[in-house]
């Protein structure tokens, strides 16, 4: 029963984990621009792995793509790799872990194959926490390499966008989310190869013994008829994310209802 | 068209103070934010705060410290602009301007002169 | 508060010649994430509200004649009116609307010589 709470909560917090790293991996926010200098600004800066913003204090906001890809930062491109990675590991691994779950009946599938399968899907989402946590920490290293240059020129030739001496970015929502859904993705593997030495099927100590029957010699083994629960899952799993794109319509958020500057 | 049409002109007393109206139309007024700019006569534009409808959502220029109240009413599509402890430097065309992308101003309100008067 | 400075306060030409607003700024208008100065240019004719001509320092506003042309980045911007016409006098005003408090320019006054 353990075995599988610990499986079955395994591949939920994954589940989680790789949600978070493909909405981290969308968002636009993963630096901002920075307000100490210029808190009143009336032109807000932001930028994401595959485009920049530009919100304005009317409320429009512009995006632009980063359409080049010999013109981005060598980084940048490991990034958005460690990223993609990450979500395609962690994929691949929810999809090894729904057949490994134990309250799923596959066929007559051994518990060893499924001991295996949660194994294999456990390094996975371990490997793919790791690669998002090491994407969001390069990132983050990067920004704060820029912050105090202050002719920082991050993203030279992307699409023309170049930062001036006024615009300083800091760590965006993007990273907080990357770091705790990278987290969540290496609990959840975790989680799994710990449930996985509790599925394997343990050596038993017991002979063969032997029955003679008249006429006929049958040898019966104890031990190999394994009981198994007989409800299937019918559960969908719905993957419900943001991507984290702002739009005009957003509702803004302010610090006071009423702001004097 | 989008439209703005001010509310007449005012006679105050100095310490008195003065409200008046901007009623939008043309436009979905709860999406946009308004400005409200005044000119003393002979002078330049002054910039006095904005107010985006959609939630009440005000800023004020620090200048006019706290005696400017901007308020709007979204089911007549009205923007106000109350003035309070009135001087006689406050005599002004005041103006109302809607904000569009590009953080500009443009379309604005015919205007409403208000006179500060003993 | 950005101040904005208008040079010269008053500008008499001669029709069909050419006039020249300046607008410097006192901190820089230009944004790095759009690469775009947010300075807007107004007209204000006797008796009426300001009218936008131009924004972003060069982009002319729908319906504005093609003899009105912005230009500048940074701190310091150009009006021109490439050929002066009678209706074209009046007040110009310039704006910032990179950082609040928005200002304005103190104005410079067209005049016919």
């Known amino acids: 029963m353990a075995v599988t709470a610990c499986q079955g909560l395994g591949f939920v917090v994954s589940l989680i984990g790789i949600a978070g790293i493909i909405a981290a991996t969308c968002m636009d926010q993963w630096s901002t621009q920075d307000l100490y200098n210029n808190p009143v600004t009336a032109v807000f800066n932001y930028q994401g792995l595959w485009r920049s913003c530009v919100r304005e204090s009317s409320g429009f906001t512009e995006c632009r793509g980063y359409f080049t890809l010999l013109g981005l930062p060598a980084m940048l491109q490991a990034v958005r790799a460690l990223m993609i990675v990450g979500i395609v590991l962690g994929a691949i691994g929810l999809l090894v872990s729904i057949f490994a779950l134990k309250c799923i009946r596959i066929g007559s599938m051994e518990d060893s194959a499924k001991a295996n399968m949660t194994l294999t899907s456990g390094i996975m989402f371990i490997v793919s926490g790791l690669c998002a946590i090491a994407g969001v920490s390069v990132f983050a290293n990067m920004l704060v390499t820029n912050f105090w240059m202050s002719t920082a020129n991050m993203y030279t030739g992307m699409g023309g966008m170049v930062q001036t001496v006024q615009t300083r970015y800091t760590f965006g929502a993007a990273l907080f989310v990357g770091w705790v859904a990278g987290g969540l993705t290496l609990i959840g593997g975790v989680m799994m190869c710990i449930a996985c030495r509790g599925l394997a099927p343990e050596e038993t100590n017991y002979k063969a013994v032997s029955y003679h029957a008249s006429g006929h010699s049958v040898a019966y083994k104890p031990g190999g008829f394994k009981a198994s629960t007989g409800f299937g899952s019918n559960t969908k799993n719905k993957k419900i994310y943001d991507g984290g794109a702002r739009t005009e319509d957003e509702v803004q958020s302010y610090p006071s209802k009423h702001d004097y500057v | 068209q989008v439209q703005l049409v001010q509310s007449g002109a005012e006679v105050k007393k100095p310490g008195s103070s003065v409200k008046v109206s901007c009623k939008a139309s043309g436009y979905a007024f709860s999406n946009y934010w308004m400005n409200w700019v005044r000119q003393a006569p002979g002078q330049g534009l002054e910039w006095m705060g904005q107010?985006?409808?959609?939630?009440?959502?005000?800023k004020y220029s620090g200048k006019f410290n706290s005696r400017v109240t901007i308020t709007a009413d979204e089911s007549t599509s009205t923007a106000y602009m109350e003035l309070s402890s009135l001087r006689s430097e406050d005599t002004a065309v005041y103006y109302c301007?809607?904000?569009?992308?590009?953080?500009?101003?443009?379309?604005w309100g015919q205007g409403t002169l208000v006179t500060v008067s003993s | 508060d950005i101040v904005m400075t208008q040079s010269p306060d008053s500008l008499a030409v001669s029709l069909g010649e050419r006039a020249t607003i300046n607008c410097k700024s006192s901190q820089t208008l230009l944004n790095g994430g759009n690469q775009k100065n947010y300075l807007t240019w107004y007209q204000q004719k006797p008796g009426q509200p300001p009218k936008l001509l131009i924004y972003w320092a060069s982009t002319r506003e729908s319906g504005v004649p093609d003899r009105f042309s912005g230009s500048g980045s940074g701190t310091d911007f150009t009006l021109t009116i490439s050929s002066l016409q009678a209706e074209d006098v009046a007040v110009y005003y310039c704006?910032?609307?990179?950082?609040?408090?928005?200002?304005f320019g103190q104005g410079t006054k067209l005049e016919i010589k």
């Open positions: 301007a809607r904000f569009y992308y590009g953080n500009v101003m443009d379309y």
């Open positions: 107010i985006y409808p959609g939630n009440g959502d005000t």
């Open positions: 704006q910032n609307g990179y950082s609040y408090p928005l200002t």
